[in-house]
């Protein structure tokens, strides 16, 4: 008797998902000497164990704890870069500024970046046809819970001055419903984090507005201040120039106006 597969609204598991995760793990440990103790087969087994044979709308953070334990990694103080709705630029930045780290520069974030996955209740199969959509199906799906879990941990372990890159082109520069707004902001530890510095990235070349005065940034400042963490904000008016100056800080044109600083 054929068993009818659950149809979800989201796209299915990324093609060759197991191979991708394992190969990324091998590559990551090859490049990062401090992670060469990691056994990638065990990492994959823990990843698989978090969602295989489980109903994909009932995944919990607990399901990912064995994986989180295996992927334990620390970022030096002052070197954490969070981002919201501006992933590409954040990643371009850390590729140049190699001593700063986004979540996707860490093992677990690197393994899962841009991938989708889910299983099916009571079978050992991976569902390549469809996976739950966060809005249309459920929020407790394997992908969403994974990012919530690792984002929480990433924020919890941050220390010193934490930086966040925000997209100044969006109507809500700071969005309370984003992973940054709903998870990371609330899991920064005041006893370890002295300050949060927001970098608001401008979209238009002629945009000279002070986006640090945006109501949503004021909202972020309020949330952070209430948590006894200081808040700073910078406008990055020219992201292309900003990256260029990170690459070549000695360039004479880099000594002026790529950003405007606000102390709050």
């Amino acid at each position: 008797v054929p068993r009818w597969r659950q149809q979800w609204s989201g796209s299915g598991t990324t093609s060759r998902f197991p191979e991708t995760v394992l190969a990324r793990c091998v590559k990551y440990t090859e490049v990062h000497p401090e992670m060469r103790h990691v056994d990638c087969q065990s990492v994959w087994d823990a990843f698989k164990g978090a969602f295989i044979s489980k109903y994909p709308c009932n995944i919990t953070e607990e399901d990912y704890q064995p994986l989180v334990k295996l992927g334990t990694q620390t970022v030096p103080c002052n070197k954490t870069l969070l981002w919201s709705r501006i992933k590409d630029l954040a990643h371009q930045f850390t590729q140049v500024q190699r001593d700063m780290f986004t979540l996707e520069d860490m093992l677990l974030g690197y393994l899962a970046d841009d991938l989708t996955w889910c299983g099916e209740f009571n079978t050992f199969e991976i569902n390549y046809q469809s996976c739950p959509d966060w809005r249309k199906d459920c929020s407790n799906n394997p992908v969403s819970v994974f990012w919530k879990t690792v984002s929480r941990r990433f924020a919890e372990t941050a220390c010193g001055v934490v930086h966040v890159m925000l997209n100044g082109s969006r109507s809500k520069i700071f969005d309370k419903n984003s992973t940054f707004g709903s998870v990371e902001v609330h899991n920064l530890q005041p006893e370890k984090v002295q300050a949060l510095e927001a970098w608001v990235i401008h979209g238009g070349r002629e945009d000279s507005r002070d986006l640090c005065q945006d109501p949503t940034i004021k909202e972020l400042e309020s949330i952070i201040s209430k948590r006894n963490i200081r808040f700073f904000c910078k406008n990055i008016y020219r992201p292309d120039k900003f990256l260029q100056c990170v690459k070549n800080p000695e360039d004479s044109s880099c000594l002026s106006g790529i950003h405007h600083h606000h102390h709050h």
Epitope: E19, T20, A23, V26, K27, E30, P33, R36, H37, C40
Partner: antibody, heavy 116, light 107 residues
């Protein structure tokens, strides 16, 4: 149980090239790295480079850069190491091994003799 | 590149005795060090990785220690099958490099 089986011994002229194959069986080939290590007669071990077949981007030791080409064919679970511009000092046993930095499974070795 | 120096070049030991092999790195390799055993006409075999973790199937008489630049492989009670050449290898910095080997022979 993963096994790596290498191609047979080769005798080559100086200046020519040699291509050694390494076929994997009994395990998942694509995402583990395959490295190449050589050993000249009576000498120690020397890492030449490696590849993660899934990504297909090889990594080479500086010493062999420009002379060695490491490739992998996922469809046949086979890795290849080609060494060009051979000289007498390249006479050695060439091993493939599983792993990108520590090598837990080794092929049986392929003797390459470079002689005029 | 990092130079790995093993000592002694040859170690003569009686069966049942303890053997201690040393490996020194020209700069710190943290704990990213492996030990291999090689018998004549055979491929090397991984014994220890991460400086002190025994590979699958390796008997407990083999143990590794050290970190940074100084490492030791100890064989607590030599068996006849342990007489071979032993190599250390660092995998902290590209290119990975091996020591020149220590030959453990029957006294």
């Amino acid at each position: 149980q993963v096994q790596l089986v290498q191609s047979g011994a080769e005798v080559k002229k100086p200046g020519s090239s040699v291509k050694v194959s390494c076929k994997a069986s009994g395990g998942l080939f694509s995402f583990y790295a395959i490295s190449w290590v050589r050993q000249a007669p009576g000498q120690g071990l020397e890492w030449m480079g490696g590849i993660i077949p899934f990504f297909g981007e090889p990594q080479y030791a500086q010493k062999f850069q420009g002379r060695v080409t490491i490739t992998a064919d996922e469809s046949t679970s086979t890795a290849y190491m080609e060494l060009s511009s051979l000289r007498s000092e390249d006479t050695a046993v060439y091993y493939c091994a599983r792993g990108s930095y520590r090598f837990d499974v080794w092929g049986q070795g392929t003797l390459v003799t470079v002689s005029a | 590149e990092i130079v790995m120096t093993q000592s002694p070049a040859t170690l003569s030991v009686s069966p049942g005795e303890r053997a201690t092999l040393s490996c020194r790195a020209s700069q710190s390799v943290s704990s990213n060090l492996a030990w291999y055993q090689q018998k004549p006409g055979q491929a090397p075999r991984l014994l220890i990785y991460g400086a002190s973790t025994r590979a699958t199937g390796i008997p407990a008489r083999f143990s590794g220690s050290g970190s940074g630049t100084e490492f030791t492989l100890t064989i607590s009670s030599l068996q006849s099958e342990d007489f071979a050449v032993y190599y250390c290898q660092q995998y902290n910095n590209w290119p990975w490099t091996f020591g020149q080997g220590t030959k453990v022979e029957i006294k």
